[in-house]
């Protein structure tokens, strides 16, 4: 690597993947193994994140970018940046302190994470239940009984997803 030429800050020419080495007359030295610098002009390289145990490596560390971790199969990330891993449950379940438990009647969970949520209360929108809810799926709301009078179309698209209601229908 060339000695930098900038008169103002000799370190400013050091590219990403290197650091300005004060011990070697401010020569741009490559980042040591297991470290990186993502921007130019750095005076040190940062240590790479290590993905161990419940974490697995999603993206390897390089001289210019940090490693990224996600969770091993059967787990999902919690928090921005995946700072913790939480066990997956099956659809129709939620994770409690006692492990994965089935959703109570009137609630559902269509994912492997998160909590069971109440079925949509169709009557709050003046609609009726077209398809009953299950542990894994919300109810599907259909037209109100009045809409099904003779001459009216008997099929309308289901209502868009909305916040779950407070009582199952």
């Amino acid at each position: 690597f060339e000695r930098t030429r900038s008169l103002q800050d000799p370190c400013s020419n050091c590219p990403a993947g290197t650091f300005c080495d004060n011990n070697r007359n401010q020569i741009c030295s490559p980042c040591p193994p297991n470290s990186f610098s993502s921007a130019g002009g750095q005076r040190t390289c940062d240590i790479c994140r290590q993905c161990k145990g419940v974490f697995r490596t999603r993206k390897e560390c390089s001289s210019t970018s940090n490693a990224e971790c996600d969770c091993t199969p059967g787990f999902h990330c919690l928090g921005a940046g995946c700072s913790m891993c939480e066990q997956d449950c099956k659809q129709g379940q939620e994770l409690t302190k006692k492990g994965c438990k089935d959703c109570c009647f009137g609630t559902f969970n269509d994912q492997k994470r998160g909590i069971c949520r109440p079925w949509t209360n169709c009557s709050l929108d003046g609609k009726s239940v077209l398809v009953n809810g299950t542990k894994e799926r919300d109810v599907v709301c259909g037209p109100s009984p009045a809409d099904l009078s003779p001459g009216a179309s008997s099929v309308t698209p289901p209502a868009p997803a909305r916040e779950p209601g407070h009582s199952p229908q």
């Epitope: 940062d46 161990k52 059967g74 928090g79 940046g81 995946c82 066990q87 492990g99």
Partner: antibody
């Protein structure tokens, strides 16, 4: 319910070895790793090592020559052994489940090293 | 090894006061810092993970902030049961390391 229960405290003679068992319930050792952390009286926490779900281990370099962690998945037990204890190894020793951070800890095992 | 330095070592305060505890890492650890509360004769209890994420069941008077090398734990209105020990720890790189702890005491 997730629990980690450690064997009872003990007095260890200088230069002797320490053995602690961490028995877990509410989760499987074939899925989760377990870490060992200690806390000398009135001081901070110190990470000693871990055994991962697959059985491989990582140790703090400061203890690698005298530390051994093993497990028996079928008995839901993790075994911690440290050799050549000295007075400054007096501490509470904890096992904790590997979640990325430590959400579940054992109750701790007080180990006193004294003649 | 990454060194985690907590300050202050101890702090005297009254119930209802706002308190900020600090933790400084010797290297950039991103957001991978956790805060633990430890009551006498008990194991540590996870309060915050990933610098800012409150763990399940932790009261919202506890707030974590910071990234890279500087982290804080703020208790907006200290309750009597909060006057105990607090530890920060980094889960970015092995060996995992912790601060020496901060003790909150009653003024």
């Amino acid at each position: 319910q997730v629990q980690l229960k450690q064997s009872r405290p003990g007095l260890v003679q200088p230069s002797q070895s320490l053995s602690i068992t961490c028995t877990v319930s509410g989760f499987s050792l074939s899925i989760y790793g377990v870490h060992w952390i200690r806390q000398p009286p009135g001081k901070g926490l110190e990470w000693l090592g871990a055994i991962w779900s697959g059985g491989s281990t990582d140790y703090n370099a400061a203890f690698i020559s005298r530390l051994s962690i093993s497990k028996d998945n079928s008995k839901s037990q993790v075994f911690f052994k440290m050799n050549s204890l000295q007075a400054d190894d007096t501490a509470i020793y904890y096992c904790a489940r590997d979640d990325g951070s430590f959400a579940y800890w054992g109750q701790g095992t007080l180990v006193t090293v004294s003649a | 090894n990454i060194v985690m330095t907590q300050s202050p070592k101890s702090m005297s305060m009254s119930v209802g006061e706002r308190v900020t505890l600090r933790c400084k890492a010797s290297e950039n650890v991103g957001i991978y810092v956790s805060w633990y509360q430890q009551k006498p004769e008990q194991s540590p209890k996870l309060l915050i993970h990933g610098a800012t994420n409150r763990y399940t069941g932790v009261p919202d008077r506890f707030t974590g902030s910071g990234s890279a090398t500087d982290f804080t734990l703020t208790i907006s209105s200290v309750q009597a049961e909060d006057l105990v020990d607090y530890h920060c720890g980094q889960s970015y790189s092995y060996p995992l390391t912790f601060g020496a702890g901060t003790k909150l005491e009653l003024k």
